[in-house]
């Protein structure tokens, strides 16, 4: 029962995590204009992995896609790749884990097959979560680097003609969504791996029965019966340590069409 619960919970947690990874990847608020010095602004800029947006004081929002592929920073391409890999692995993991669920009967699938599928999906969720966390962390690192660079050099010349105040960007909501979602997927994957250990079929080993003929009497010596659960060695007293996903305390909200910042 505990195994089924662990597997089911792992599946649900991973499902929420992967939904979060997809949401984060699609969100436009990966980086948002830093409003530290000016909390009220007439023009608010924010950027995602796929497009950049500007919201004016009236609430009018205009988004422009990154139509170039070669002109984009390598780091942004790497983040995109990590997030997509995370989504693909997570989606495959979900598909595999559906068939691996103990509560779902599919033909005459053996427990050993379900155990293997559970382990496979668990590993996929772990890798998927790690990809998302890595992608978000790379982007966050990129933001921090650019933030301090633009702080040190607040004014940059545009073609040597126009002095323009460089817009500084800080962490957007998508980063926090991504970190939490990656963490959930990772935890879900670990839970699937734990559940896998309890799903392995029980090995029933009968010792050879020996018959000894001594006269007319037949001596029957029954062998001991040993059941072991898990793969190979005994699994008693093994502890699994998993780190929880850390999130920032601050919450950012974004106004609607009718808002201005």
């Amino acid at each position: 029962m505990a195994v089924t619960a662990c597997q089911g919970l792992g599946f649900v947690v991973s499902l929420i995590g992967i939904a979060g990874i997809i949401a984060a990847t699609c969100m436009d608020q990966w980086s948002t204009q830093d409003l530290y010095n000016n909390p009220v602004t007439a023009v608010f800029n924010y950027q995602g992995l796929w497009r950049s947006c500007v919201r004016e004081s009236s609430g009018f929002t205009e988004c422009r896609g990154y139509f170039t592929l070669l002109g984009l920073p390598a780091m942004l391409q790497a983040v995109r790749a990590l997030m997509i890999v995370g989504i693909v692995l997570g989606a495959i993991g979900l598909l595999v884990s559906i068939f691996a669920l103990k509560c779902i009967r599919i033909g005459s699938m053996e427990d050993s097959a379900k155990a293997n599928m559970t382990l496979t999906s668990g590993i996929m969720f772990i890798v998927s979560g790690l990809c998302a966390i890595a992608g978000v962390s790379v982007f966050a690192n990129m933001l921090v680097t650019n933030f301090w660079m633009s702080t040190a050099n607040m004014y940059t010349g545009m073609g040597g003609m126009v002095q323009t105040v460089q817009t500084r960007y800080t962490f957007g909501a998508a980063l926090f969504v991504g970190w939490v979602a990656g963490g959930l997927t990772l935890i879900g994957g670990v839970m699937m791996c734990i559940a896998c250990r309890g799903l392995a079929p029980e090995e029933t080993n009968y010792k050879a029965v020996s018959y000894h003929a001594s006269g007319h009497s037949v001596a029957y010596k029954p062998g001991g019966f040993k059941a072991s659960t898990g793969f190979g060695s005994n699994t008693k007293n093994k502890k699994i340590y998993d780190g929880g996903a850390r999130t920032e305390d601050e919450v950012q909200s974004y106004p609607s069409k009718h808002d201005y910042v």
Epitope: A42, V43, C53, V54, E56, S58, R64, H258
Partner: antibody, heavy 120, light 113 residues
Framework: QVQLVQSGAEVKKPGASVKVSCKTS????????MLWVRQAHGQSLEWMGN????????TYALKFKGRVTMTVDRSTSTVYMELSSLRSEDTAVYYC?????????????WGQGTLVTVSS | DIVMTQSPDSLAVSLGERATINCKSS????????????LAWYQQKPGQPPKLLIY???TRESGVPDRFSGSGSGTDFTLTISSLQAEDVAVYYC?????????FGQGTKVEIK
């Protein structure tokens, strides 16, 4: 057609308050930001603040903070601007204007103006 | 606050001639996020409220004659009246629409020579 009709001229004593109204028609009132701009005689225009009619959220110019209050009445599609602790330098024509929504924060429609005279 | 400085303060031009008004801002009005300039031009005739002519530095408001055109980027902007008409006699203002507080130039009075 879009119309912004302001209340009539006012004469006030220093230290008093004035409340100017701006009744709008011809468009969806809550969809557009409303601004207040004043102009002293022979002088340039001076932005006082904005109000978002949907939320009633305001942004005031630092110069007027604490003295100006902008409010809306959604039932009559009217915006109000109240200026307190009036001084002689507050004598000006007060305009309400509508933000053009997709016009890069420009003001596309203006009221006819309300002359406020502060005199002892 | 962004300071908007217009030049000249007044301008006398013959009918049918070109009138050029300059506006300089103390900070850039160019927004890198959408590659747009946040500057507007208004026309104000005596006893009337201002009328929007140009927004986004160069986009003409609907109904505005095409003899009015705006140009410039960053900190330097220009309003041009290609062929001055009698009805163009007015005071013209530029406005910073990029940052709060919104600020206006001191105005340029256009007259007929």
């Amino acid at each position: 057609q879009v119309q912004l009709v302001q209340s009539g001229a006012e004469v006030k004593k220093p230290g008093a308050s004035v409340k100017v109204s701006c009744k709008t028609s011809g468009y969806s009132f809550t969809d557009y930001l409303m601004l207040w701009v004043r102009q002293a005689h022979g002088q340039s225009l001076e932005w006082m603040g904005n109000i978002n009619p949907y939320y009633g959220r305001t942004t005031y110019a630092l110069k007027f903070k604490g003295r100006v209050t902008m409010t809306v009445d959604r039932s009559t599609s009217t915006v109000y601007m109240e200026l307190s602790s009036l001084r002689s330098e507050d004598t000006a024509v007060y305009y309400c204007a509508r933000d053009g929504y997709s016009l890069r924060n420009a003001m596309d429609y203006w009221g006819q103006g309300t002359l406020v005279t502060v005199s002892s | 606050d962004i300071v908007m400085t217009q030049s000249p303060d007044s301008l006398a031009v013959s009918l049918g001639e070109r009138a050029t008004i300059n506006c300089k801002s103390s900070q850039s009005l160019f927004n890198s996020g959408n590659q747009k300039n946040y500057l507007a031009w208004y026309q104000q005739k005596p006893g009337q409220p201002p009328k929007l002519l140009i927004y986004g530095a160069s986009t003409r408001e609907s109904g505005v004659p095409d003899r009015f055109s705006g140009s410039g980027s960053g900190t330097d902007f220009t309003l041009t009246i290609s062929s001055l008409q009698a009805e163009d006699v007015a005071v013209y203002y530029c406005q910073n629409a990029h940052s709060y507080p919104y600020t206006f130039g001191q105005g340029t009075k256009v007259e007929i020579k």
